[in-house]
Amino acid sequence: ILGGREAEAHARPYMASVQVNGEHLCGGVLVAEQWVLSAAHCLEDAADGKVQVLLGAHSLSQPEPSKRLYDVLRAVPHPDSRPDTIDHDLLLLQLSEKATLGPAVRPLPWQRVDRDVEPGTLCDVAGWGIVSHAGRRPDRLQHVLLPVLDRATCNRRTHHDGAITQRMMCAESNRRDSCKGDSGGPLVCGGVLEGVVTSGSRVCGNRKKPGIYTRVASYAAWIDSVLA
Protein backbone atom coordinates (compact mmCIF):
# COMPACT_ATOMS: atom_id res chain seq x y z
CA ILE A 1 0.00 0.00 0.00
CA LEU A 2 1.49 3.32 -1.05
CA GLY A 3 0.60 6.49 0.85
CA GLY A 4 -1.41 4.63 3.46
CA ARG A 5 -0.98 4.00 7.14
CA GLU A 6 -0.85 1.11 9.54
CA ALA A 7 -4.27 -0.43 10.00
CA GLU A 8 -5.88 -0.76 13.38
CA ALA A 9 -4.81 -4.19 14.60
CA HIS A 10 -7.36 -6.91 13.81
CA ALA A 11 -10.01 -4.37 12.74
CA ARG A 12 -10.21 -6.17 9.39
CA PRO A 13 -10.84 -9.74 10.53
CA TYR A 14 -11.49 -10.87 6.95
CA MET A 15 -7.92 -10.04 5.88
CA ALA A 16 -5.75 -12.93 4.74
CA SER A 17 -2.12 -13.29 3.74
CA VAL A 18 -1.61 -15.83 0.99
CA GLN A 19 1.82 -17.29 1.62
CA VAL A 20 4.26 -19.49 -0.27
CA ASN A 21 6.91 -21.34 1.70
CA GLY A 22 6.13 -19.12 4.68
CA GLU A 23 6.54 -15.82 2.83
CA HIS A 24 3.76 -13.34 2.10
CA LEU A 25 2.89 -13.39 -1.60
CA CYS A 26 -0.57 -11.87 -1.97
CA GLY A 27 -3.51 -10.57 -0.06
CA GLY A 28 -6.76 -12.44 0.28
CA VAL A 29 -10.16 -12.08 1.87
CA LEU A 30 -12.11 -14.60 3.91
CA VAL A 31 -15.51 -14.90 2.23
CA ALA A 32 -16.75 -18.05 3.96
CA GLU A 33 -15.59 -20.16 6.90
CA GLN A 34 -13.44 -22.35 4.67
CA TRP A 35 -12.82 -20.13 1.66
CA VAL A 36 -10.47 -17.26 0.86
CA LEU A 37 -10.83 -15.16 -2.29
CA SER A 38 -7.65 -13.88 -3.93
CA ALA A 39 -6.22 -13.18 -7.40
CA ALA A 40 -5.56 -15.92 -9.95
CA HIS A 41 -2.15 -14.55 -10.96
CA CYS A 42 -0.93 -15.10 -7.41
CA LEU A 43 -0.79 -18.82 -8.12
CA GLU A 44 1.55 -18.25 -11.07
CA ASP A 45 4.05 -16.62 -8.74
CA ALA A 46 3.73 -19.52 -6.33
CA ALA A 47 5.42 -21.94 -8.78
CA ASP A 48 5.62 -25.30 -7.00
CA GLY A 49 5.88 -23.87 -3.51
CA LYS A 50 3.62 -24.74 -0.61
CA VAL A 51 0.63 -22.38 -0.55
CA GLN A 52 -0.84 -21.54 2.84
CA VAL A 53 -3.19 -18.89 4.19
CA LEU A 54 -2.54 -16.82 7.27
CA LEU A 55 -5.65 -15.54 9.09
CA GLY A 56 -6.04 -13.40 12.19
CA ALA A 57 -2.79 -11.55 11.61
CA HIS A 58 -1.72 -7.96 11.99
CA SER A 59 2.03 -8.47 12.14
CA LEU A 60 3.47 -11.05 9.78
CA SER A 61 6.44 -11.77 12.03
CA GLN A 62 5.29 -11.33 15.62
CA PRO A 63 3.34 -13.95 17.57
CA GLU A 64 -0.32 -13.02 17.98
CA PRO A 65 -2.94 -15.12 19.76
CA SER A 66 -5.40 -14.88 16.85
CA LYS A 67 -2.90 -15.83 14.13
CA ARG A 68 -3.20 -19.17 12.45
CA LEU A 69 -1.69 -20.61 9.29
CA TYR A 70 -3.96 -22.89 7.25
CA ASP A 71 -2.99 -25.35 4.57
CA VAL A 72 -4.85 -25.16 1.28
CA LEU A 73 -6.97 -28.13 0.37
CA ARG A 74 -7.92 -26.86 -3.08
CA ALA A 75 -7.03 -23.89 -5.25
CA VAL A 76 -9.67 -22.88 -7.81
CA PRO A 77 -8.64 -20.16 -10.24
CA HIS A 78 -11.38 -18.70 -12.40
CA PRO A 79 -11.57 -20.97 -15.48
CA ASP A 80 -11.16 -18.03 -17.87
CA SER A 81 -8.15 -16.45 -16.16
CA ARG A 82 -5.04 -16.31 -18.34
CA PRO A 83 -1.40 -15.45 -17.60
CA ASP A 84 -1.28 -12.67 -20.21
CA THR A 85 -4.37 -10.73 -19.14
CA ILE A 86 -5.94 -9.32 -15.98
CA ASP A 87 -9.40 -10.50 -17.05
CA HIS A 88 -11.15 -12.82 -14.57
CA ASP A 89 -8.29 -12.46 -12.09
CA LEU A 90 -9.92 -14.38 -9.25
CA LEU A 91 -8.86 -17.37 -7.21
CA LEU A 92 -10.72 -19.26 -4.52
CA LEU A 93 -8.67 -21.12 -1.92
CA GLN A 94 -10.33 -23.82 0.16
CA LEU A 95 -8.73 -24.10 3.56
CA SER A 96 -7.82 -27.53 4.92
CA GLU A 97 -10.46 -26.97 7.61
CA LYS A 98 -13.01 -24.37 8.60
CA ALA A 99 -11.39 -21.30 10.08
CA THR A 100 -11.80 -20.76 13.80
CA LEU A 101 -13.89 -17.63 13.88
CA GLY A 102 -13.60 -14.89 16.46
CA PRO A 103 -13.12 -11.11 16.79
CA ALA A 104 -9.98 -11.26 14.63
CA VAL A 105 -11.18 -13.84 12.09
CA ARG A 106 -14.51 -13.26 10.38
CA PRO A 107 -15.77 -13.57 6.76
CA LEU A 108 -16.66 -10.38 4.93
CA PRO A 109 -20.01 -10.01 3.15
CA TRP A 110 -19.46 -9.59 -0.57
CA GLN A 111 -21.46 -7.65 -3.12
CA ARG A 112 -23.95 -9.71 -5.11
CA VAL A 113 -25.82 -6.90 -6.85
CA ASP A 114 -24.10 -6.33 -10.18
CA ARG A 115 -24.14 -2.54 -10.17
CA ASP A 116 -21.19 -0.15 -10.37
CA VAL A 117 -20.03 1.59 -7.21
CA GLU A 118 -20.68 5.31 -7.57
CA PRO A 119 -17.53 7.16 -8.68
CA GLY A 120 -16.08 9.20 -5.85
CA THR A 121 -17.09 6.65 -3.22
CA LEU A 122 -14.26 6.17 -0.73
CA CYS A 123 -13.28 2.53 -0.42
CA ASP A 124 -10.76 0.83 1.83
CA VAL A 125 -7.96 -1.32 0.49
CA ALA A 126 -5.56 -3.13 2.82
CA GLY A 127 -2.54 -5.34 2.47
CA TRP A 128 1.04 -6.23 3.30
CA GLY A 129 2.28 -5.12 -0.12
CA ILE A 130 5.20 -2.76 -0.65
CA VAL A 131 4.98 0.69 0.94
CA SER A 132 7.61 2.48 -1.15
CA HIS A 133 8.83 2.54 -4.73
CA ALA A 134 12.06 1.12 -3.37
CA GLY A 135 10.12 -2.02 -2.54
CA ARG A 136 10.08 -1.84 1.25
CA ARG A 137 7.75 -4.47 2.69
CA PRO A 138 5.80 -3.73 5.87
CA ASP A 139 5.51 -6.19 8.72
CA ARG A 140 2.16 -4.87 9.88
CA LEU A 141 -1.03 -4.52 7.85
CA GLN A 142 -1.42 -1.23 5.98
CA HIS A 143 -4.54 0.38 4.54
CA VAL A 144 -5.63 3.38 2.51
CA LEU A 145 -8.92 4.99 1.48
CA LEU A 146 -9.26 5.48 -2.27
CA PRO A 147 -11.99 7.16 -4.34
CA VAL A 148 -13.60 5.01 -7.02
CA LEU A 149 -12.91 6.28 -10.54
CA ASP A 150 -15.44 6.05 -13.36
CA ARG A 151 -14.65 3.50 -16.07
CA ALA A 152 -14.64 5.97 -18.95
CA THR A 153 -11.82 7.94 -17.34
CA CYS A 154 -9.96 4.74 -16.51
CA ASN A 155 -10.25 3.64 -20.14
CA ARG A 156 -8.68 6.79 -21.59
CA ARG A 157 -5.60 6.40 -23.75
CA THR A 158 -3.54 8.18 -21.10
CA HIS A 159 -4.82 5.74 -18.45
CA HIS A 160 -5.58 2.07 -19.18
CA ASP A 161 -6.49 2.58 -22.83
CA GLY A 162 -9.61 0.48 -23.14
CA ALA A 163 -8.44 -2.43 -20.95
CA ILE A 164 -11.11 -1.96 -18.28
CA THR A 165 -14.09 -4.21 -18.83
CA GLN A 166 -17.50 -4.14 -17.14
CA ARG A 167 -16.18 -6.77 -14.76
CA MET A 168 -13.49 -4.45 -13.41
CA MET A 169 -13.49 -1.22 -11.47
CA CYS A 170 -10.85 1.43 -10.92
CA ALA A 171 -9.74 3.53 -7.99
CA GLU A 172 -7.64 6.67 -8.02
CA SER A 173 -3.91 6.20 -7.67
CA ASN A 174 -2.47 9.66 -7.01
CA ARG A 175 0.34 8.72 -4.60
CA ARG A 176 -2.11 6.61 -2.60
CA ASP A 177 -2.51 3.18 -4.17
CA SER A 178 -2.42 -0.57 -3.84
CA CYS A 179 0.83 -2.07 -5.06
CA LYS A 180 2.95 -5.21 -5.46
CA GLY A 181 2.04 -7.71 -2.76
CA ASP A 182 -1.46 -6.27 -2.30
CA SER A 183 -2.84 -8.30 -5.21
CA GLY A 184 -5.73 -10.51 -4.18
CA GLY A 185 -6.62 -8.22 -1.30
CA PRO A 186 -10.02 -6.62 -0.68
CA LEU A 187 -11.45 -3.31 -1.83
CA VAL A 188 -14.19 -2.64 0.70
CA CYS A 189 -16.89 -0.03 0.18
CA GLY A 190 -19.46 0.59 2.91
CA GLY A 191 -18.43 -2.56 4.77
CA VAL A 192 -19.00 -4.79 1.73
CA LEU A 193 -16.40 -6.46 -0.47
CA GLU A 194 -16.69 -4.84 -3.91
CA GLY A 195 -13.35 -5.57 -5.54
CA VAL A 196 -10.24 -7.69 -5.44
CA VAL A 197 -6.87 -6.11 -6.25
CA THR A 198 -5.73 -7.41 -9.64
CA SER A 199 -2.24 -8.74 -9.97
CA GLY A 200 0.08 -7.48 -12.66
CA SER A 201 3.06 -5.26 -13.27
CA ARG A 202 1.12 -1.98 -13.11
CA VAL A 203 3.06 1.06 -11.98
CA CYS A 204 1.82 2.17 -8.54
CA GLY A 205 1.05 5.65 -7.25
CA ASN A 206 0.85 7.24 -10.69
CA ARG A 207 -2.35 9.20 -11.13
CA LYS A 208 -2.54 8.24 -14.81
CA LYS A 209 -2.47 4.51 -14.03
CA PRO A 210 -5.39 3.91 -11.67
CA GLY A 211 -5.64 0.81 -9.54
CA ILE A 212 -7.62 -2.00 -11.17
CA TYR A 213 -9.93 -4.21 -9.15
CA THR A 214 -11.97 -7.24 -10.15
CA ARG A 215 -15.64 -6.64 -9.36
CA VAL A 216 -16.84 -9.56 -7.24
CA ALA A 217 -20.51 -8.93 -8.02
CA SER A 218 -19.79 -9.75 -11.63
CA TYR A 219 -18.62 -13.20 -10.55
CA ALA A 220 -21.35 -14.03 -8.04
CA ALA A 221 -22.52 -17.10 -9.96
CA TRP A 222 -19.00 -18.51 -10.18
CA ILE A 223 -18.23 -17.84 -6.51
CA ASP A 224 -21.50 -19.46 -5.44
CA SER A 225 -20.87 -22.49 -7.63
CA VAL A 226 -17.42 -23.08 -6.15
CA LEU A 227 -18.51 -22.50 -2.57
CA ALA A 228 -21.58 -24.74 -2.96
Epitope: P119, D150, R151, A152, T153, N155, R156, R157, T158, H159, H160, D161, G162, A163, I164, Q166
Partner: antibody, heavy 115, light 107 residues
Framework: EVQLVQSGAEVKKPGASVKVSCKAS????????MYWVRQAPGQGLEWIGE????????NFNEKFKSRATLTVDTSTSTAYLELSSLRSEDTAVYYC????????WGQGTLVTVSS | DIQMTQSPSSLSASVGDRVTITCKAS??????VAWFQQKPGKAPKGLIR???SRYSGVPSRFSGSGSGTDFTLTISSLQPEDFATYYC?????????FGQGTKVEIK
Protein backbone atom coordinates in the same frame (compact mmCIF):
# COMPACT_ATOMS: atom_id res chain seq x y z
CA GLU B 1 -18.70 -5.31 -33.77
CA VAL B 2 -18.10 -1.75 -32.60
CA GLN B 3 -19.71 0.90 -34.78
CA LEU B 4 -20.15 4.65 -34.63
CA VAL B 5 -22.84 5.75 -37.07
CA GLN B 6 -23.30 9.46 -37.66
CA SER B 7 -26.26 11.42 -38.95
CA GLY B 8 -26.47 12.61 -42.54
CA ALA B 9 -25.14 15.70 -44.27
CA GLU B 10 -26.57 19.09 -43.35
CA VAL B 11 -26.80 22.43 -45.17
CA LYS B 12 -27.23 25.43 -42.89
CA LYS B 13 -27.40 29.19 -43.23
CA PRO B 14 -24.93 31.46 -41.41
CA GLY B 15 -26.08 32.15 -37.85
CA ALA B 16 -28.04 28.91 -37.60
CA SER B 17 -27.24 25.87 -35.43
CA VAL B 18 -26.59 22.26 -36.35
CA LYS B 19 -26.86 19.11 -34.27
CA VAL B 20 -24.88 16.06 -35.36
CA SER B 21 -25.54 12.67 -33.82
CA CYS B 22 -23.26 9.67 -33.33
CA LYS B 23 -24.90 6.36 -32.43
CA ALA B 24 -22.60 3.84 -30.79
CA SER B 25 -23.08 0.09 -30.78
CA UNK B 26 -21.05 -3.02 -29.98
CA UNK B 27 -19.64 -1.78 -26.65
CA UNK B 28 -20.75 -0.28 -23.35
CA UNK B 29 -21.36 3.35 -24.24
CA UNK B 30 -20.72 4.74 -20.76
CA UNK B 31 -17.30 3.06 -20.49
CA UNK B 32 -15.51 5.34 -22.95
CA UNK B 33 -15.22 9.06 -23.57
CA MET B 34 -16.39 10.26 -26.97
CA TYR B 35 -14.51 13.02 -28.71
CA TRP B 36 -15.30 15.17 -31.72
CA VAL B 37 -12.97 16.29 -34.49
CA ARG B 38 -13.63 18.34 -37.59
CA GLN B 39 -11.89 18.64 -40.94
CA ALA B 40 -12.46 21.58 -43.25
CA PRO B 41 -12.21 20.82 -47.00
CA GLY B 42 -8.60 20.07 -47.92
CA GLN B 43 -7.44 20.85 -44.38
CA GLY B 44 -6.15 18.95 -41.38
CA LEU B 45 -7.87 17.59 -38.27
CA GLU B 46 -9.06 19.83 -35.45
CA TRP B 47 -10.17 18.60 -32.02
CA ILE B 48 -13.43 20.18 -30.81
CA GLY B 49 -13.98 18.55 -27.45
CA GLU B 50 -15.00 15.40 -25.61
CA UNK B 51 -17.65 14.06 -23.27
CA UNK B 52 -17.70 11.41 -20.58
CA UNK B 53 -21.00 9.58 -21.27
CA UNK B 54 -21.10 8.24 -17.71
CA UNK B 55 -20.91 11.59 -15.94
CA UNK B 56 -21.67 14.10 -18.68
CA UNK B 57 -18.39 15.90 -17.95
CA UNK B 58 -16.98 17.75 -20.95
CA ASN B 59 -13.68 19.24 -22.06
CA PHE B 60 -13.47 21.71 -24.93
CA ASN B 61 -11.00 23.29 -27.23
CA GLU B 62 -11.19 26.93 -26.11
CA LYS B 63 -11.88 27.91 -29.71
CA PHE B 64 -15.26 26.13 -29.62
CA LYS B 65 -16.21 26.54 -25.96
CA SER B 66 -18.75 29.30 -26.49
CA ARG B 67 -20.47 27.69 -29.49
CA ALA B 68 -20.26 23.92 -29.04
CA THR B 69 -22.47 21.78 -26.82
CA LEU B 70 -21.76 18.09 -26.24
CA THR B 71 -24.48 15.86 -24.85
CA VAL B 72 -25.33 12.16 -24.68
CA ASP B 73 -28.44 10.04 -24.47
CA THR B 74 -27.34 6.91 -22.64
CA SER B 75 -30.68 5.19 -23.28
CA THR B 76 -29.91 5.14 -27.01
CA SER B 77 -26.08 5.16 -26.75
CA THR B 78 -25.95 8.34 -28.80
CA ALA B 79 -23.60 11.30 -28.54
CA TYR B 80 -24.48 14.72 -29.93
CA LEU B 81 -22.52 17.73 -31.05
CA GLU B 82 -24.42 20.99 -31.43
CA LEU B 83 -22.64 23.95 -32.98
CA SER B 84 -24.35 27.34 -32.90
CA SER B 85 -23.83 30.70 -34.63
CA LEU B 86 -22.56 28.94 -37.73
CA ARG B 87 -20.33 30.75 -40.19
CA SER B 88 -18.93 29.75 -43.55
CA GLU B 89 -15.62 28.63 -42.02
CA ASP B 90 -17.51 25.97 -40.04
CA THR B 91 -18.06 24.09 -43.31
CA ALA B 92 -16.34 20.80 -42.58
CA VAL B 93 -16.72 17.08 -42.05
CA TYR B 94 -17.42 16.42 -38.37
CA TYR B 95 -16.28 13.13 -36.85
CA CYS B 96 -17.01 11.42 -33.56
CA UNK B 97 -14.37 9.03 -32.22
CA UNK B 98 -14.13 6.75 -29.21
CA UNK B 99 -11.41 7.63 -26.73
CA UNK B 100 -9.50 4.55 -25.56
CA UNK B 101 -8.95 1.03 -26.82
CA UNK B 102 -9.12 0.58 -30.57
CA UNK B 103 -9.42 3.85 -32.52
CA UNK B 104 -13.03 3.71 -33.66
CA TRP B 105 -14.29 6.70 -35.68
CA GLY B 106 -17.65 7.55 -37.17
CA GLN B 107 -17.96 7.86 -40.94
CA GLY B 108 -18.20 11.65 -40.72
CA THR B 109 -20.97 14.19 -41.27
CA LEU B 110 -20.55 16.97 -43.81
CA VAL B 111 -21.92 20.28 -42.58
CA THR B 112 -22.10 22.98 -45.22
CA VAL B 113 -22.68 26.57 -44.14
CA SER B 114 -23.81 28.74 -47.02
CA SER B 115 -26.12 31.65 -47.58
CA ASP C 1 -1.80 24.86 -26.83
CA ILE C 2 0.78 22.26 -27.78
CA GLN C 3 1.83 22.58 -31.40
CA MET C 4 2.59 19.38 -33.30
CA THR C 5 4.89 20.24 -36.19
CA GLN C 6 4.92 17.48 -38.77
CA SER C 7 7.48 17.12 -41.53
CA PRO C 8 7.63 16.85 -44.40
CA SER C 9 4.23 18.21 -45.42
CA SER C 10 4.37 15.96 -48.47
CA LEU C 11 6.70 13.42 -49.99
CA SER C 12 6.94 11.31 -53.13
CA ALA C 13 8.06 7.73 -52.79
CA SER C 14 8.02 4.44 -54.65
CA VAL C 15 6.61 1.06 -53.63
CA GLY C 16 9.23 -0.68 -51.47
CA ASP C 17 10.76 2.56 -50.18
CA ARG C 18 11.37 3.20 -46.51
CA VAL C 19 9.45 6.29 -45.46
CA THR C 20 9.97 8.32 -42.29
CA ILE C 21 7.64 11.05 -41.04
CA THR C 22 8.53 13.13 -38.01
CA CYS C 23 6.45 15.07 -35.53
CA LYS C 24 7.84 17.58 -33.05
CA ALA C 25 5.80 18.70 -30.03
CA SER C 26 6.23 22.22 -28.70
CA UNK C 27 6.49 20.78 -25.18
CA UNK C 28 6.94 17.41 -23.50
CA UNK C 29 4.03 15.03 -24.16
CA UNK C 30 5.69 11.89 -22.73
CA UNK C 31 4.63 9.07 -25.05
CA UNK C 32 1.03 10.28 -25.43
CA VAL C 33 1.15 10.38 -29.22
CA ALA C 34 -0.95 8.58 -31.82
CA TRP C 35 -0.55 8.29 -35.59
CA PHE C 36 -3.44 8.13 -38.04
CA GLN C 37 -3.73 7.32 -41.72
CA GLN C 38 -6.42 9.00 -43.80
CA LYS C 39 -7.47 8.31 -47.36
CA PRO C 40 -9.61 10.75 -49.37
CA GLY C 41 -13.26 10.75 -48.32
CA LYS C 42 -12.63 8.37 -45.41
CA ALA C 43 -12.35 8.73 -41.66
CA PRO C 44 -8.87 8.56 -40.14
CA LYS C 45 -7.63 5.09 -39.20
CA GLY C 46 -5.52 4.53 -36.10
CA LEU C 47 -2.06 3.12 -36.71
CA ILE C 48 -0.05 3.76 -33.55
CA ARG C 49 -0.82 4.76 -29.97
CA UNK C 50 1.44 5.50 -27.00
CA UNK C 51 4.09 6.57 -29.54
CA UNK C 52 5.10 3.02 -30.45
CA SER C 53 2.26 0.51 -29.96
CA ARG C 54 0.55 -0.66 -33.13
CA TYR C 55 -3.21 -0.97 -33.11
CA SER C 56 -4.41 -4.50 -33.74
CA GLY C 57 -4.61 -5.34 -37.43
CA VAL C 58 -2.02 -2.75 -38.44
CA PRO C 59 0.76 -4.28 -40.58
CA SER C 60 4.18 -4.63 -38.95
CA ARG C 61 5.75 -2.39 -41.61
CA PHE C 62 4.32 0.53 -39.64
CA SER C 63 6.30 1.46 -36.55
CA GLY C 64 6.42 4.42 -34.23
CA SER C 65 9.09 5.71 -31.89
CA GLY C 66 9.96 8.66 -29.71
CA SER C 67 9.12 10.26 -26.40
CA GLY C 68 9.10 13.75 -24.94
CA THR C 69 9.00 16.06 -27.94
CA ASP C 70 10.30 14.08 -30.92
CA PHE C 71 8.32 11.34 -32.62
CA THR C 72 8.69 9.29 -35.77
CA LEU C 73 6.41 7.15 -37.91
CA THR C 74 8.27 4.74 -40.17
CA ILE C 75 6.89 2.64 -43.02
CA SER C 76 9.61 0.08 -43.64
CA SER C 77 8.54 -0.92 -47.15
CA LEU C 78 5.88 1.23 -48.75
CA GLN C 79 2.94 -0.66 -50.27
CA PRO C 80 0.44 0.63 -52.87
CA GLU C 81 -2.29 0.89 -50.22
CA ASP C 82 -0.09 3.13 -48.04
CA PHE C 83 -0.40 6.19 -50.27
CA ALA C 84 -2.44 8.48 -48.01
CA THR C 85 -2.14 11.39 -45.59
CA TYR C 86 -0.67 10.72 -42.15
CA TYR C 87 -1.35 12.71 -39.00
CA CYS C 88 0.22 12.68 -35.55
CA UNK C 89 -1.87 13.59 -32.51
CA UNK C 90 -0.86 14.40 -28.94
CA UNK C 91 -3.31 13.49 -26.19
CA UNK C 92 -1.21 14.46 -23.20
CA UNK C 93 -2.74 17.92 -22.73
CA UNK C 94 -5.91 19.83 -23.57
CA UNK C 95 -6.72 20.71 -26.19
CA UNK C 96 -5.73 17.57 -28.06
CA UNK C 97 -3.84 18.67 -31.15
CA PHE C 98 -2.88 17.17 -34.49
CA GLY C 99 0.04 17.72 -36.80
CA GLN C 100 -0.83 19.40 -40.09
CA GLY C 101 -0.47 16.13 -41.99
CA THR C 102 2.00 14.50 -44.37
CA LYS C 103 0.75 13.48 -47.79
CA VAL C 104 2.56 10.42 -49.15
CA GLU C 105 2.30 10.37 -52.95
CA ILE C 106 3.46 7.99 -55.65
CA LYS C 107 6.73 9.02 -57.28
Amino acid sequence: EVQLVQSGAEVKKPGASVKVSCKASGYTFTSYYMYWVRQAPGQGLEWIGEINPYSGDTNFNEKFKSRATLTVDTSTSTAYLELSSLRSEDTAVYYCAREGGFAYWGQGTLVTVSS
Amino acid sequence: DIQMTQSPSSLSASVGDRVTITCKASQNVDTDVAWFQQKPGKAPKGLIRSASSRYSGVPSRFSGSGSGTDFTLTISSLQPEDFATYYCQQYNNYPLTFGQGTKVEIK
